[in-house]
Interface confidence: low
């Protein structure tokens, strides 16, 4: 006899990185017929939703209208059908950004390189942080961690045309509180003639995500956001 239901899927819209004072919705998708969903934050019950009618709804949304450092952390959700509870979802790391200060991002030897050259990004922030994060626009799994008192370096090694794109960095005050994003640095990698076509970078994460992240407005959320990739989440842990 089945003792638990399959775990629900949890994600954040429009993004798991939320500028402070902006809105985010935590979505939990379970099964049709679920009469109750619970959202847990840092291990404690945070919110409850009871969909009506349960047989026609398999997803609930928990709305956070104004993100701040106290709302940042690890979320999970569970649901109930009758008296039977599900396994807990994977952990969602909700990150608050735009805290305190703005780092600077530079690239060596420069933003235009030839395929095969060794490239290193440098992220610098003079305030009290020792962890830095480098993100490549267009793909959530491209998150790298670096450490340093004032500056972290991110060696990409010999680059290929797959490395080209727009990069930003953050200083991290803790796992769930990040600085403002740096100004973007566009890396242009030229390679063999047959490799220079600009193919889409990654269909799993929309190219306009950064625009959404930076311009989350008070008028509403981007509803049709692709589900973010767990790799970025795992890098936070």
């Amino acid at each position: 006899q089945q003792q638990t239901l399959p775990k629900p899927f949890i994600w954040a819209e429009p993004h798991f990185m939320v500028p402070k004072e902006k809105q985010v919705t935590i979505c939990c998708q379970g099964n049709y017929g679920a009469v109750e969903y619970q959202l847990h934050f840092e291990g404690s019950l945070f919110a409850v939703d009871r969909p009506k009618p349960p047989e026609r709804i398999n997803k609930v949304q928990f709305y956070i209208p104004d993100m701040n450092s106290r709302m940042a952390g690890q979320y999970s959700c569970i649901y109930r059908v009758g008296e039977l509870w599900s396994e807990p979802s994977n952990l969602l790391d909700l990150v608050v950004t735009e805290m305190y200060d703005t780092p600077t991002l530079s690239v060596h030897p420069g933003p235009e390189v030839i395929s095969g050259e060794k490239v290193t990004f440098y992220c610098r922030l003079d305030t009290a942080t020792s962890m830095f994060l480098l993100l490549k626009e267009g793909r959530s799994s491209h998150v790298q961690r670096g450490y340093g008192k004032v500056q972290a370096e991110f060696p990409l090694g010999p680059v290929t045309t797959a490395h080209r794109g727009t990069y930003r960095c953050f200083g991290s005050y803790n796992n769930h509180a990040w600085s403002f994003p740096s100004e973007p640095v566009k890396l242009l990698v030229t390679g063999d003639i047959e490799n220079t076509s600009l193919a889409p970078e990654d269909p799993t994460f929309p190219a306009d995500t950064w625009g959404t992240y930076l311009l989350t407005t008070e008028t509403g959320l981007q509803k049709d956001h692709a589900l973010w990739d767990h790799t970025a989440q795992n890098l936070l842990r």
């Epitope: 402070k20 928990f62 709305y63 509403g220």
Partner: antibody, heavy 120, light 107 residues
Framework: QVQLQQSGPELVKPGASVKMSCKAS????????INWGKQRSGQGLEWIGE????????YYNEKFKAKATLTADKSSNIAYMQLSSLTSEDSAVYFC?????????????WGQGTSVTVSS | DIQMTQTTSSLSASLGDRVTISCRAS??????LNWYQQKPDGTVKLLIY???RLHSGVPSRFSGSGSGTDYSLTINNLEQEDIATYFC?????????FGGGTKLEIK
């Protein structure tokens, strides 16, 4: 402009229930939390609870958990508070207030208040 | 629950005066302190949020300061329209709690 229009005064008998409303206009109702507070004559304010109209999720002050029920109707942009098993202690002015999106738990726009008098 | 104390329940001042209203929390509230004005007709308005940030439309003669457990609201150049009761509120920990209010009157 942002406005919260509360329902009119209520005179109710002890033991009865009352349901008051707070109609929001001038902003996207589901984007902001609605708080409810209580003010007895000549006294300070007490926070009763808050509701997220977007999801129906609410938080209550433990003191009012058995007394107040908060709901919201997204289609009409109205938040409701029902008070049950009324006693003279519940005679007060009740306010609804929108919580600003500062992440700082400040209530940036308030209704004009609904006066509730409990008397036999 | 965090207790918010406004020790002065009423104070008198003259038009043009500088008035300071204080508020004390029973524990550190990390600057999550807001000030409200309640007019005699019952209308409530947000003046200051997060200790010192002026809410939109609020005259610049209002200012806030403080940290830890002690906070204050200052009104420079008191005007007739400032006659009201002023409440502080902590937004650090649920349940959100308010001070008892300070009623400002004209001498």
């Amino acid at each position: 402009q942002v406005q919260l229009q509360q329902s009119g005064p209520e005179l109710v008998k002890p033991g009865a229930s009352v349901k008051m409303s707070c109609k929001a206009s001038g902003y996207t109702f589901t984007d902001y939390v609605i708080n409810w507070g209580k003010q007895r004559s000549g006294q300070g304010l007490e926070w009763i609870g808050e509701i997220y109209p977007g999801s129906g999720t609410n938080y209550y002050n433990e003191k009012f958990k058995a007394k107040a029920t908060l709901t919201a109707d997204k289609s009409s942009n109205i938040a409701y508070m029902q008070l049950s098993s009324l006693t003279s202690e519940d005679s007060a002015v009740y306010f609804c207030a929108r919580r600003g999106r500062y992440g700082l738990y400040a209530m940036d726009y308030w209704g004009q208040g609904t006066s509730v008098t409990v008397s036999s | 629950d965090i207790q918010m104390t406004q020790t002065t329940s009423s104070l008198s001042a003259s038009l043009g005066d500088r008035v300071t209203i204080s508020c004390r929390a029973s524990q550190d509230i990390s600057n999550y302190l807001n000030w409200y004005q309640q007019k005699p007709d019952g209308t409530v308005k947000l003046l200051i949020y997060y200790t010192s940030r002026l809410h939109s439309g609020v005259p610049s003669r209002f200012s806030g300061s403080g940290s830890g457990t002690d906070y204050s609201l200052t009104i420079n150049n008191l005007e007739q329209e400032d006659i009201a009761t002023y409440f502080c509120q902590q937004g650090n920990t649920r349940p959100w709690t308010f001070g008892g209010g300070t009623k400002l009157e004209i001498k």
